[in-house]
């Protein structure tokens, strides 16, 4: 048993029928010694008396809020949560496996630049009685500070018969050095509690691996005289690291006809302009990627040819 936060405790249980469970001793937080009784949740049934209560925790029915009283007055509470271990593996029931980039990916994180700021998100089908707490650090043995905000519900989607809820959190490395080579990964830890169940999820990454620039901005077309060609120009996104001479991007320019089946013309360039042929009803799209480290491409920025 361990303390998650004040008056909230997690009991780790092997989740198979013959497992012995955990013997837990609760102590009433009071100087009183006599006349103390214990109850569980809203029940008035007295479970025991005395300053301590010993319980055998085996099932969710043994978890919940234990309260000690004296003469009708509440003295203290202890909330017991369960963390299930099935076949030697901690349960991962609360969050959905996003399966990207690989199976058992519950947390996904992205950074728009090298400033040490990043966003993580996760998915669940649970709509109520759900709380998250996020902690982060760089390295684990001698951790350096990363500050995370509160997790918030950022999107709701319908997936077949189910509703899916996306939560996200923003974190900032306290003493980020954008130009430095990373040697220790960022660790992100999410505590998830659904009713009486506790689970934890972790992700470990280097900022360089989760970089995804914003799309290029100010995408413009300039027709070239007496030609079907146009000059496409754009700018680095505002959120990208500076100076651009050091934090450089490379770009992919794509001409896409109305039909998805039509052949796409693609041009790769390190410049912020390119000359392409603009077909009727086509659109021109540009996306960006770190020039020196192949992390994710940005989303596309697009303009119609007409």
């Amino acid at each position: 048993i361990w303390e998650l936060k004040k008056d909230v405790y997690v009991v780790e249980l092997d989740w198979y029928p013959d497992a012995p469970g955990e013997m837990v001793v609760l102590t009433c937080d009071t100087p009183e010694e006599d006349g103390i009784t214990w109850t569980l949740d809203q029940s008035s049934e007295v479970l025991g008396s005395g300053k301590t209560l010993t319980i055998q925790v085996k099932e969710f029915g043994d978890a919940g809020q234990y309260t000690c009283h004296k003469g009708g007055e509440v003295l203290s509470h202890s909330l017991l949560l369960l963390h299930k271990k099935e076949d030697g593996i901690w349960s991962t029931d609360i969050l959905k496996d996003q399966k990207e980039p690989k199976n058992k990916t519950f947390l996904r994180c992205e950074a728009k630049n090298y400033s040490g700021r990043f966003t993580c998100w996760w998915l669940t089908t649970i709509s109520t009685d759900l709380t998250f707490s996020v902690k982060s650090s760089r390295g684990s043995s001698d951790p350096q500070g990363v500050t995370c905000g509160a997790a918030t519900l950022s999107a709701e989607r319908v997936r077949g018969d189910n509703k899916e809820y996306e939560y996200s959190v923003e974190c900032q490395e306290d003493s980020a050095c954008p130009a430095a080579e990373e040697s220790l990964p960022i660790e992100v830890m999410v505590d998830a509690v659904h009713k009486l169940k506790y689970e934890n999820y972790t992700s470990s990454f280097f900022i360089r691996d989760i970089i995804k620039p914003d799309p290029p901005k100010n995408l413009q077309l300039k027709p070239l005289k007496n030609s079907r060609q146009v000059e496409v120009s754009w700018e680095y996104p505002d959120t990208w690291s500076t100076p651009h001479s050091y934090f450089s991007l490379t770009f992919c320019v794509q001409v896409q006809g109305k039909s998805k089946r039509e052949k796409k013309d693609r041009v790769f360039t390190d410049k912020t302009s390119a000359t392409v042929i603009c077909r009727k009803n086509a659109s021109i799209s540009v996306r960006a990627q770190d020039r020196y480290y192949s992390s994710s491409w940005s989303e596309w920025a697009s303009v119609p040819c007409s």
Epitope: W15, A19, E59, F60, G61, A63, L196
Partner: nanobody
Framework: EVQLVESGGGLVQAGGSLRLSCAAS????????MGWFRQAPGKEREFVAA????????DYADSVKGRFTISRDNAKNTVYLQMNSLKPEDTATYYC??????????????????WGQGTQVTVSS
């Protein structure tokens, strides 16, 4: 979508046996207390038996103790009710119910969140 599907009911002679099954989907099965209830024509629904999430705690109605056994297979998302030494008064529709994070001493049907459609058990004398 949560589904509980009972099977195994039928007609049996007094003293005989039946094994009811209830297959669950759409829930994290091992988090749920699973209960069996029954309702005879013109009577109130009554509690029969319940089993906690990992199967370490069981509860039975006095009328079936020693004759009925509840069990579960969390790998198969299924709960069973083995009924031996059946009596004509066991004739009823048997329902399976689920309660996430519940307690086995929930003998009131109102404490359960999800219900099956029921399977008929008839015991002839």
């Amino acid at each position: 979508e949560v589904q509980l599907v009972e099977s195994g009911g039928g007609l049996v002679q007094a003293g005989g046996s039946l094994r009811l099954s209830c297959a669950a989907s759409g829930i994290i099965f091992s988090d749920n207390v699973m209960g069996w209830f029954r309702q005879a024509p013109g009577k109130e629904r009554e509690f029969v038996a319940a089993i906690a999430g990992r199967g370490s705690r069981l509860d039975y109605a006095d009328s079936v103790k020693g004759r009925f056994t509840i069990s579960r297979d969390n790998a198969k998302n299924t709960v069973y009710l083995q009924m031996n030494s059946l009596k004509p008064e066991d004739t009823a529709t048997y329902y399976c119910a689920a309660k996430p994070y519940g307690r086995v001493f929930y003998t009131e049907g109102s404490n359960y969140d999800f219900w099956g459609q029921g399977t008929q058990v008839t015991v002839s004398s």
